[in-house]
């Protein structure tokens, strides 16, 4: 627009000024005036601003508190805040990452879908027919039933989608 | 303290191109619009365009559309003009000046509040 | 494009004299004018923006008014530093353009 409607994308009014915001990893020492710029000072160590602002404290990084499962992904800068995530076998209870529960898993019956990473759970899936798991575990994708026939074998006992077939030898013609 | 400093003297030849640098201190560069103005000797202010320094999004005069090209590089704090296909009437002093806007009355109002030294462009056989 | 028309385009005074700088637009700009002022081989310096407001630092003796299409720049009591060139330019309309100039000469 002609002539502006507005301060510029990275300005503030302020007392009848455009004042320029700070630029991320500082924050505002004082609002600029009709004779003075923008006065603004970088954050300190463990401190950071992500965004171009007018705040007059920088936040905090992220503690990453190992007694809660986590541990540093990628270290903050003064424009960036601390990422955290779980230890291994562990994962987020939340999108902020604040806490870590036990990756579930799957019960007999059961397999994984998806292995669990940092930040999800383990998804399960009942096994379907043909397939089975026997154990409880975060890991295991439920497996095939043993095919009996190219053992030469047949079924003696049907599988379910806990355990699997048993085979056995064919019974012999009699004469 | 706010200072635009611009480069040298310039002297080219028609049909050339020059890019004039403008160096910025004393602010926070990508804050405030910056426009490009020059003057033919002995003559007025001309007003060329302006650049958002944050964006190097240009905007420009229709008279110097597709021989102007405003840019910028934010990690050095310094905004560019390049005009080609030089011509003797593109003899002139080229200004960068940045924009403050005061707001009253409702209503937001541009000048600007500070000038680079200017660069002399002559363009001569 | 708006046309700034200044006049005189040329002006001799002495030390001391209350001078008075036109501008007129081609068209209606409201408040939308700044005036500059301009020595030999030196860049230009803002006097006045929003047609009567003072750039800090500037001396009082500058004042500016108007709107729409008629400005007007005063020098209440000329000094020696003031002998230069006064441009008024608009800002409301692209290009934003400048008037031709004024230039303040001793008499």
């Known amino acids: 627009p002609e002539p502006p409607t507005a301060c510029r994308e990275k300005q503030y009014l302020i007392n009848s000024q455009c004042c320029s915001l700070c630029q991320p990893g500082q924050k505002l020492v004082s609002d600029c005036t009709e004779f003075t710029e923008t006065e603004c000072l970088p954050c300190g160590e463990s401190e950071f601003l992500d965004t171009w602002n007018r705040e007059t404290h920088c936040h905090q990084h992220k503690y990453c508190d190992p007694n809660l499962g986590l541990r540093v992904q990628q270290k903050g800068t003064s424009e960036t805040d601390t990422i955290c995530t779980c230890e291994e076998g562990w994962h987020c209870t939340s999108e902020a990452c604040e806490s870590c529960v036990l990756h579930r898993s799957c019960s007999p019956g059961f397999g994984v879908k998806q292995i669990a990473t940092g930040v999800s759970d383990t998804i399960c899936e009942p096994c379907p027919v043909g397939f089975f798991s026997n154990v409880s575990s975060a890991f295991e994708k439920c497996h095939p039933w043993t095919s009996c026939e190219t053992k030469d074998l047949v079924v003696q006992q049907a599988g379910t989608n806990k355990t699997d077939v048993v085979c056995g030898p064919q019974d012999r013609l009699r004469a | 303290q706010v200072q635009l400093v611009q480069s040298g003297a310039e002297v080219k030849k028609p049909g050339a191109s020059v890019k004039v640098s403008c160096k910025a201190s004393?602010?926070?560069?990508?804050?405030?619009?910056m426009y490009w103005v020059r003057q033919a000797p002995g003559q007025g202010l001309e007003w060329m365009g302006w650049?958002?320094?944050?964006?190097?999004?240009?905007t420009y005069a229709q008279k110097f559309q597709g021989r102007v090209t405003m840019t910028r590089d934010t990690s050095i704090s310094t905004a560019y003009m390049e005009l080609s296909r030089l011509r003797s009437d593109d003899t002139a002093v080229y200004y960068c000046?940045?924009?403050?806007?005061?707001?009253?009355?409702?209503?937001?109002?541009?000048?600007?509040?500070?000038w680079g030294q200017g660069t002399l462009v002559t363009v001569s056989s | 494009d708006i046309q700034l028309t200044q006049s005189p385009s040329f002006l001799s005074a002495s030390v001391g004299d209350r001078v008075t700088i036109t501008c007129r637009a081609s068209?209606?700009?409201?408040?939308?004018l700044a005036w500059y002022q301009q020595k030999p081989g030196k860049a230009p310096k803002l006097l006045i923006y929003?047609?009567?407001t003072l750039q800090s630092g500037v001396p009082s003796r500058f004042s500016g008014s108007g709107s729409g299409t008629e400005f007007t720049l005063t020098i209440s009591s000329l000094q020696p530093e003031d002998f230069a060139t006064y441009y008024c330019?608009?800002?409301?309309?692209?290009?934003?353009?400048f008037g031709q100039g004024t230039k303040v000469e001793i008499k």
């Open positions: 330019q608009q800002l409301t309309s692209y290009p934003w353009t």
């Open positions: 004393g602010y926070t560069f990508a804050g405030y619009y």
């Open positions: 068209q209606g700009i409201s408040s939308y």
């Open positions: 929003a047609a009567s």
């Open positions: 650049i958002n320094p944050d964006s190097g999004a240009p």
């Open positions: 000046a940045r924009e403050k806007i005061y707001y009253g009355s409702g209503n937001y109002y541009p000048s600007f509040d500070y």
